[in-house]
């Protein structure tokens, strides 16, 4: 048994009393203005879990997707930027693992996905407040951080299942597809556009949805822009963050998971053929960071509508490093 | 301030040893790959050895068998320890610093090896 | 292992000149290379890291470009204590491999 813990996935905003028409007026262009906004932004996800049988023992596994190739991972814990983060592990792909306590062991499961296993005692142990962070170095794309914690009402002996999301086929049919509706999407957002731009916009209600029931979406392409979209930027305190340890400074990101077929050539450590990706739960803070790996510390103005990004205060790599003092 | 100091080198005959030590501060020790790199004398520089933190080690082929890196974080030291040596390892020895994954920062002075009878 | 080839090896140039150094890869390495700086007699100091991020303390008039298998050093107005020897450094695999460098000289 386990308790799992993954950063929402947000959906838009119910209308309040408007008819059928306006529901899904208000709808559709809404979702395809997202996925015109999100399409080809590559994710990060985070999957938080605490074993039931060592209930200080966490397993943390993170997963990208995105085009480009991966050229650094580095998993750490205490929060994105400015709250200190401590780097647990960093994993290469051409150089090997590094890996400090309280880390027992890391490992490259797919080409894309990383899983981290943390020692359930002594003094640097975690605990289930403990926020934990994944950047994934991508070229060319840039830097990619997810963060994701257990939430603090996590019951080691439950184990709510994942809502189940649809697979993800990671072939050229796939692509040739997600494409064309994407482009379809786009021009027929245009279209409604143009249609209703002398009408009145209707007025925008609270979502109503319980923060425990989470609404199945039959597709939701960019967890990262999506999620940031929407999610105020909130901090965790770390009650058990490791004095022990020396700080870094990882930045918060987006996660949830699905299943995607991965091909799993020339990682050093041979790993599995599947990676587990996200998929929309409920629990935990999410944030995104775009900062190409080239220009560190040079971070754009703006990934997109309503991003939150965390720019690296101390400039391309200060004299302590690309993660801050270590 | 950053440091790193190296020591040990000196004049040595062909088949002898040598151990060069590096004394780093300023900086968390642990947290950083040590490298040695060499230089002869008029050539280029030449990567040696790596030692990652918990003590992962890579070395240059030609002194693979002959070289043994090794670290002691509770001293923040890095050492080299040479054997068989011959008359090609003559160079300056830098102690290099690396962030992993991100390249090579911050050199030390070096320190000199003669290999010669 | 990965070859680093640097050109040219050595260059004649003036104070305010613009001077571009190259590295080739025999192999694609992303953006994992740096650029050093070494004076006669010092220990190599980086410029560059990632390809093309200046290092923390380095003046503006340096930069760096490229990615994969083709790499360059620019400076673009030279000084008097830019005369030095340059090295390209790749850090993507083992073993880690420097350029052959390129001396600056002065014109």
């Known amino acids: 048994m386990r308790t799992e813990a993954q950063v929402p996935a947000l959906q838009p905003p119910e209308p309040g009393l408007e008819g059928a028409m306006g529901h899904r007026t208000l709808v559709l262009p809404w979702v395809l203005l997202t996925l015109c906004v999100t399409a080809g932004t590559p994710e990060v996800w985070v999957q938080v879990r605490m074993e039931a049988t060592e209930l200080s023992s966490f397993t943390i596994r993170c997963g990208f997707l995105g085009s480009g190739s991966i050229s650094l991972v580095t998993v750490s814990w205490g929060g994105p930027n400015g709250a200190g983060g401590t780097t647990l592990a960093v994993l290469h792909p051409e150089r090997g693992i590094r890996q400090w306590a309280p880390a027992r062991q890391a490992r490259w499961e797919t080409q894309s996905s990383i899983s981290l296993i943390l020692e359930g005692s002594g003094a640097s142990s975690p605990c289930a407040n403990t926020t934990f962070c994944c950047k994934f170095a991508s070229f060319p794309e840039g830097s990619w951080e997810a963060c994701g914690s257990l939430p603090p009402s996590s019951d080691p002996g439950l184990s709510a299942p994942p809502t189940p999301a649809p697979i993800l086929r990671a072939d050229l049919a796939g692509i040739l597809g997600v494409s064309g509706v994407l482009l379809f999407g786009c021009v027929y957002l245009l279209h409604l556009l143009r249609r209703h731009k002398h009408r009145p916009a209707p007025r925008l209600q609270p979502s109503r949805t319980s923060p425990q029931a989470p609404r199945a979406r039959a597709w939701a392409p960019s967890q990262a822009s999506q999620a940031a979209l929407h999610v105020p930027y909130a901090t965790i305190n770390t009650s058990c963050r490791p004095a022990t340890l020396d700080t870094a400074h990882p930045h918060g990101g987006p996660s949830w998971w699905a299943s995607l077929p991965t091909h799993a050539a020339h990682r050093p450590q041979g790993p599995a053929a599947w990676a587990s990706t996200p998929i929309p739960a409920r629990g935990s803070f999410v944030s995104v960071e775009n900062g190409l790996y080239a220009q560190a510390g040079e971070r754009p103005p703006h990934t997109g509508p309503g991003l939150t990004l965390f720019p690296d205060p101390r400039g391309p790599r200060a004299m302590e490093g690309p993660l801050g003092v270590r | 301030e950053v440091q790193l100091v190296e020591s040990g080198g000196g004049l040595v005959q062909p088949g002898g040893s040598l151990r060069l030590s590096c004394a780093a501060s300023?900086?968390?020790?642990?947290?950083?790959?040590m490298h040695w790199v060499r230089q002869a004398p008029g050539k280029g520089l030449e990567w040696v050895s790596d030692?990652?933190?918990?003590?992962?080690?890579y070395y240059l082929g030609s002194v693979k068998g002959r070289f043994t890196i090794s670290r002691e974080n509770a001293k923040n030291s890095l050492y080299l320890q040479m054997n068989s040596l011959r008359a090609g390892d003559t160079a300056v020895y830098y102690c290099?610093?690396?962030?992993f994954g991100y390249g090579m920062d911050v050199w030390g002075q070096g320190t000199t090896v003669t290999v010669s009878s | 292992d990965i070859q680093m080839t640097q050109s040219p090896s050595s260059l004649s140039a003036s104070v305010g000149d613009r001077v571009t150094i190259t590295c080739r890869a025999s192999?694609?390495?992303?953006?994992?290379l740096g650029w050093y700086q070494q004076k006669p007699g010092k220990a190599p100091k980086r410029l560059i890291y990632?390809?093309?991020s200046l290092q923390s303390g380095v003046p503006s008039r340096f930069s760096g470009s490229g990615s994969g298998t083709e790499f360059t050093l620019t400076i673009s107005s030279l000084q008097p204590e830019d005369f030095a020897t340059y090295y390209c450094?790749?850090?993507?695999?083992?073993?880690?491999?420097f350029g052959g460098g390129t001396k600056v000289e002065i014109k």
């Open positions: 192999q694609g390495i992303r953006n994992d």
């Open positions: 450094l790749q850090h993507l695999d083992y073993p880690l491999t």
């Open positions: 030692i990652g933190n918990s003590g992962e080690t």
């Open positions: 300023g900086f968390t020790f642990r947290n950083y790959d």
């Open positions: 990632a390809a093309s």
């Open positions: 290099v610093r690396e962030e």
